[in-house]
């Protein structure tokens, strides 16, 4: 019900409806790092390290905490109010399309294309046409797969973004 | 708007009890959280927290005083009551109610003074 | 009990300063402390929650800080206004406690 009536008594926070009129939405809700008790009387401390709560909120649990995978670098740990932020390891990336999982970066770029953008923990190798100067998305395989590498074998995607 | 107001008798004799009401409008204590507490202060000195009260009838009370308080509520009439058994000078106080849900007692009435006095 | 001690009964500042008010908890609180204004003659009004949070139309020269055991209240460019007693809570678990009270006098 506490999602339902308009929350007067305290500060605002970020998932307040945005139809009603509330002069102090945070009425009824816990803060970052805390849920709210089961019986709805108390705000309850998310445990360190554990989970978390990044909003004022009305959840019964705290969210869990992201373990970073193997491949990935732990940027900063998990608190009561923020997630663990990964990122994956050197020479390796994330892309939008499969954020699950960091895929190695392309040592180097198809013949007849320069690199104009390094390996990124969230972007692949940038590559251009020499003459025209314009980005490449096909997939085309690197320089030493070229030589090396047997027909089919798939190869990333050159990076699109810039 | 929310608002609280305390009322009492004034004045009381030593070993009386002590009968105040808290009127209340713009929340009701049937909403799940919701909770008024009365808290006293002595002229010129701190607070003291009293007793609690939920929407679902369930009571806190402070240890020091337990035994001599009793806190209930009218929720259809949107009233709080506290009674203070056998009450002496020490209990000549401002006493005030407060709302709270979740958190600090964010609407405070205007408070109602109470002498003890033989 | 949690004890909630607010070492300095007094504190004298001038117009336009910057003063700040300390509240330490006998055992560790959290978060859960509010700050609470008391001017002359009136009732109590919160300023502060979940020892940060400014509550609805408290100016922002009012902030506070603090958690575990130990918290802060501090007005920045203070005003005349300004002149009034000040309370720490703990409302982590019962009973709540309030500190002794900080009062704000003007040069």
């Known amino acids: 019900e506490s999602a339902l009536i308009t929350q007067q008594d305290l500060a605002p926070q970020q998932r307040a409806a945005p139809q009603q009129k509330r002069s102090s939405p945070s009425e009824g809700l816990c803060p970052p790092g805390h849920h709210i008790s089961e019986d709805g009387r108390d705000c309850i401390s998310c445990k360190y390290g554990q989970d978390y709560s990044t909003h004022w909120n009305d959840l019964l649990f705290c969210l869990r905490c992201t373990r970073c995978d193997s491949g990935e670098v732990e940027l900063s740990p998990c608190t009561t109010t923020r997630n663990t932020v990964c990122q994956c390891e050197e020479g390796t990336f994330r892309e939008e399309d499969s954020p699950e999982m960091c895929r190695k970066c392309r040592t180097g770029c198809p013949r007849g294309m320069v690199k104009v953008g390094d390996c990124t923990p969230w972007s692949d190798i940038e590559c251009v046409h020499k003459e025209s100067g314009t980005k490449h998305s096909g997939e085309v395989p690197a320089v030493e797969e070229t030589v090396t590498s047997s027909p089919g074998t798939p190869a990333s995607p050159c990076s699109l973004s810039g | 708007q929310v608002t609280l107001k305390e009322s009492g008798p004034g004045i009381l004799q030593p070993s009386q009890t002590l009968s105040l009401t808290c009127s209340f409008s713009?929340?009701?204590?049937?909403?799940?959280?919701?909770?008024v507490s009365w808290i006293r202060q002595p002229s010129g000195k701190g607070l003291e927290w009293l007793a609690h009260i939920y929407w679902d009838d369930d009571k806190r009370y402070n240890p020091s005083l337990k035994s001599r308080l009793t806190i209930s509520k009218d929720t259809s009439r949107n009233q709080v009551f506290l009674k203070i058994t056998s009450v002496d000078t020490a209990d000549t106080a401002t006493y005030y109610c407060?709302?709270?849900?979740?958190?600090?007692?964010?609407?405070w009435g205007q408070g109602t003074l109470v002498t003890v006095s033989a | 009990d949690i004890v909630m001690t607010q070492s300095h009964k007094f504190m004298s500042t001038s117009v336009g300063d910057r003063v700040s008010i300390t509240c330490k908890a006998s055992q560790d609180v959290g978060t859960a402390v509010a700050w609470y204004q008391q001017k002359p003659g009136q009732s109590p009004k919160l300023l502060i929650y979940w020892a940060s949070t400014r509550h609805t139309g408290v100016p922002d020269r009012f902030t506070g800080s603090g958690s575990g055991t130990d918290f802060t209240l501090t007005i920045s460019n203070v005003q005349s206004e300004d002149l009034a007693d000040y309370f720490c809570?703990?409302?982590?678990?019962?009973?709540?406690?309030f500190g002794g009270g900080t009062k704000l006098e003007i040069k």
């Open positions: 713009g929340f009701s204590l049937s909403t799940s959280g919701m909770g």
């Open positions: 809570q703990q409302y982590s678990s019962y009973p709540y406690t």
């Open positions: 407060a709302r709270r849900r979740l958190g600090p007692f964010a609407y």
